[in-house]
Interface confidence: medium
């Protein structure tokens, strides 16, 4: 006899769940490893997924489903710090699975739905970690969580264009097929399908902005929440021409003859998944920190154009955003190879490391523009002092890849909002699940931002202090493990996280984070919306709320205006000034010649054989 | 009672650094915010910044960054804060100010106990 | 930054007068402003929080009043210690800034 409470019927068959406890006595129910999509397996490697064929039997998703091929990170075994981010599931090409987690209400129904996309670079990431578990969420809310695994590294985003058989994106693709699947089920389990808010972390929340942006993903949800992540930026997507050359060179480090695309395709889905995962650091045209193998591509379908020129043009979904960052976004990739960093030391970084550091950090610069980064981030009174050197570091990291991306769109989405209140053309309906519109062809826009800086670190961080609020540890507030007695939280940090949760929920439910569930609002002092000429923005920790202006605004002028403006400028200057070095050598040795033949000259007798 | 009190009177020259405390007495230091403002005559008063005693999170008036560093000592209950690279700009009152405590329920940062002020001149 | 705009700069009254200060924002602040006095030689104190809400010990007759960008301190039947210089503070958005004082006089 199976409990009719744990067995629920959707469009593709029977699913068994189980019920999981959560800590004031109570429990929710989760389906863990619900298939969603036909395993990409074979010649399914490399392409679009395939949603789902019914099945007859009732499924069991009482576990959570295998991880996909990845990366694992071995620099530090069994430091919980690296290794909480490591699949904790078998890997395996079979992973197109999600995970629901309903509150144990007597009869749910038309509940919120919040979906969770995880971060790791397009390279890693998995829904099974111990920090993505939605059950506190789900509880404390009352909203239905649901996450799913996409396809990461060369299986999720290789690219050949013109090719069918591996047109690029395809990770993107497995999460809107996810996104589609709460659609059309997610009510059977007493979720509002026309009430879905996405919601992500670094390359999650670059994911979560991509969907914005890209018009057949617009309809599948509502809302977004995007956490030190945007879709805009240095390392979140390529060019066509520049995917073709990594897929070619991981071809031919995994010893695929040169070819054309069709052997190479077959090639590579000859090869066994860790040789692809080996090598897929060695197809990197350069090292630098925040760099990935194999990102997003600008397709011109998934994307019909680069997000910073989709931002641009307003042509993104019209509706209401959370997004924000942590204070140290960059100290984590900083122990990751750049020169003078460890987690094992206080990271005291010489002036020489400094320099070294930039290099690494801002790959694409050359050295003008490496020099304006440098002239910005020293403290000229000051620039041998090793902490200083250290902060500044972190700060490059995080400004660049993190920080001022996330606030150009920020400032962007904002901007649209304001331009739509003016022109006052007929509105698409833009609450509505269904507005695949653009911020820029509607009236009366639904735009409103809502922008946080956390800056809490956790009393039981395991990494060292000089690395600060880290990226990624903001997770762990916002899926409620503070609540877990056993996880050795402060009480302060138990409120901040159930406060952090009920801010993320009724942003889900009401597009308004200071808005609960009743209509009510808890304190007098409120969040923000945050706006292109002001920037006000909440600081998220274990004190009262307190609203500022201004995202590192100098640095990110910086890095938004100034520095693509410089490189732009100087893009040939080195090319020229070689180019313009040989000429001169050339002249040089001209004229000297031509000097030697004019003192000859002026030494003869004149006239002399008139 | 509440009391801060702060250090003596300092002359300094141009160029120079100098640190100056604010004892605190009366209340629980690490659960109250500690301010520091500057008062001269030019300006009124001026907030440099504020700090958390119990996290040791700052927050500064970007226009004081690069001339103040708040610290403090849990175990004395004192705040400090330096200015460096003083010049005649910098003669002033500076005051220790505390705000708010450290709760996720009150909402309001305006100083409710001030320290006597601590005079300094900067002068060659 | 917010600009915080008082007035007058100065003001002279008698003794069991009616008196009003004024402070200006620049924007709105939802009324996160404070009003403190500060007599000659001594450290400013607390009078008013939030815009209307005396601070403990604060006689009645001093009282908080406005909202948006527009606050005023009022103080009814004025005592020859209320001689004094009076600030208004705002904590809606850091940095928190001060309005420039009013000097008030006894005639």
């Known amino acids: 006899q199976t409990d009719p409470e744990l067995t629920i019927m959707t469009r593709l068959g029977q699913v068994q769940g189980t019920r999981l406890p959560v800590p004031d006595r109570s429990h929710v129910i989760a389906f863990l490893g619900i298939p969603f999509a036909e395993p990409p397996l074979g010649k399914m490697r490399f392409k679009p997924p395939e949603p789902k064929k019914p099945w007859n039997d009732v499924f069991d998703a009482r576990d959570y489903p295998s991880a996909c091929y990845q990366y694992v990170d071995t620099s530090y075994p069994g430091f919980s710090g690296t290794e909480m981010w490591n699949p904790n599931r078998m890997m395996s090409e079979d992973c197109l699975y999600l995970n629901v987690w309903v509150p144990a209400t007597p009869r749910p129904h038309n509940l919120t739905v919040m979906v969770w996309i995880y971060g790791g670079g397009f390279y890693s990431g998995s829904s099974s970690l111990d920090v993505y578990d939605g059950r506190y969420l789900a509880h404390s809310e009352k909203v239905v969580v649901v996450s799913m695994n996409y396809r990461v590294s060369a299986f999720g985003f290789l690219a050949l264009n013109g090719s069918a058989e591996a047109p690029g994106n395809v990770g993107l693709l497995d999460q809107r097929l996810a996104l589609q699947w709460v659609q059309d089920n997610i009510h059977f389990f007493g979720g509002n399908p026309k009430q879905v808010t996405i919601f992500g972390e670094s390359a999650g929340a670059a994911s979560v902005g991509m969907h914005l942006l890209s018009p057949d993903s617009r309809p599948k949800f509502t809302r977004a929440i995007l956490q030190s992540g945007v879709p805009n930026g240095p390392w979140r997507t390529v060019s066509f021409d520049e995917a073709r050359r990594r897929a070619i060179k991981l071809g031919r480090l995994v010893g695929c003859p040169d070819g054309n695309d069709t052997d190479l395709i077959d090639c590579l889905r000859s090869k066994q998944p860790q040789d692809l995962i080996d090598q897929e650091w060695l197809v990197l045209p350069f090292s630098g920190l925040f760099r990935f193998s194999f990102v997003p591509v600008i397709d011109g379908v998934v994307f019909p154009d680069t997000p910073e020129a989709m931002l641009n043009s307003g042509n993104f979904k019209d509706t209401q955003i959370l997004l924000g960052v942590n204070q140290n976004e960059g100290s984590y990739f900083l122990i990751y190879g750049a020169p003078g960093f460890s987690k094992d030391n206080e990271s005291l970084i010489t002036r020489e490391d400094f320099l070294q550091g930039v290099k690494m950090s801002v790959p694409h610069a050359n050295e003008i523009g490496l020099e304006a980064v440098i002239l910005q981030y020293t403290d000229w009174m000051d620039e041998d002092n090793p902490i200083k050197n250290r902060e500044a570091m972190d700060d490059i990291v995080g400004d660049h890849n993190v920080v001022c991306p996330l606030q150009h769109f920020a400032k962007m989405y904002a901007q649209y909002s304001i331009l739509q209140g003016q022109t006052g053309t007929a509105s698409q309906g833009n609450l509505g699940w269904g507005n695949s519109g653009s911020a820029s062809n509607s009236g009366n826009s639904q735009v409103s931002v809502y922008l946080y800086m956390f800056d809490h670190r956790a009393s039981n961080l395991v990494w060292p202090e000089w690395m600060g609020v880290i990226h990624g540890y903001e997770i762990e507030f916002v899926f409620g493990l503070p609540l877990e007695k056993r996880l050795n939280y402060t009480l302060e940090e138990e409120k901040l996280s159930r406060r952090m949760m009920k801010y993320w929920a009724n942003f889900a439910r009401t597009g308004n984070p200071n808005i609960n569930v009743d209509g009510s609002i808890d304190s007098r002092r409120r969040w923000p919306v945050f706006t292109s000429t002001e920037q006000k923005h909440v600081g998220l920790n274990t004190d009262s709320l307190k609203v500022h202006k201004g995202l590192k605004s100098q640095f990110c002028a910086l890095w938004n205006r100034f520095l693509p403006r410089l490189l732009n400028v100087t893009e040939n200057i080195d090319d020229a000034e070689r180019q313009w070095k040989a000429e001169f050598h050339r002249w040089s040795s001209y004229m000297m010649h031509w000097k030697n033949q004019f003192d000859h000259y002026s030494k003869q007798e004149r006239c002399t054989n008139l | 009672e509440v009391q801060l009190q702060q250090s003596g009177p300092e002359l300094v020259k141009p160029g120079a650094s100098v640190k100056i405390s604010c004892k605190a007495s009366?209340?629980?230091?690490?659960?109250?915010?500690m301010n520091w403002v500057k008062q001269s005559p030019e300006k009124s008063l001026e907030w440099i910044g504020e700090?958390?005693?119990?996290?040791?999170?700052?927050t500064y008036n970007q226009n004081f960054k690069a001339k103040a560093t708040l610290t403090v000592d849990q175990s004395s209950s004192t705040a400090y804060m330096q200015l460096k690279s003083l010049t005649s700009e910098d003669s002033a009152v500076y005051y220790c100010?505390?705000?708010?405590?450290?709760?996720?329920?009150?909402?309001?940062?305006?100083?409710?106990?001030w320290g006597t002020g601590t005079t300094v001149t900067v002068s060659s | 930054d917010i600009q915080m705009t008082q007035s007058p700069a100065s003001l002279s009254a008698s003794v069991g007068a009616t008196v009003t200060i004024t402070c200006r924002t620049s924007?709105?602040?939802?009324?996160?402003l404070a009003w403190y006095q500060q007599r000659q030689g001594k450290s400013p104190q607390l009078l008013v929080y939030?815009?209307?809400n005396l601070a403990d010990g604060v006689p009645s007759r001093f009282s908080g009043s406005g909202s948006g960008t527009q606050y005023s301190l009022k103080i009814n039947s004025l005592q020859s210690e209320d001689v004094a210089r009076y600030y208004c503070?705002?904590?809606?958005?850091?940095?928190?800034?001060f309005g420039g004082g009013t000097q008030l006089e006894i005639k």
């Open positions: 939030a815009a209307t």
């Open positions: 924007e709105n602040i939802d009324s996160y």
């Open positions: 503070q705002h904590y809606s958005t850091t940095p928190w800034t």
């Open positions: 009366g209340y629980s230091f690490t659960g109250y915010y």
């Open positions: 700090m958390s005693p119990s996290t040791g999170r700052t």
């Open positions: 100010a505390r705000s708010v405590p450290l709760t996720t329920l009150i909402e309001d940062w305006y100083f409710d106990v």
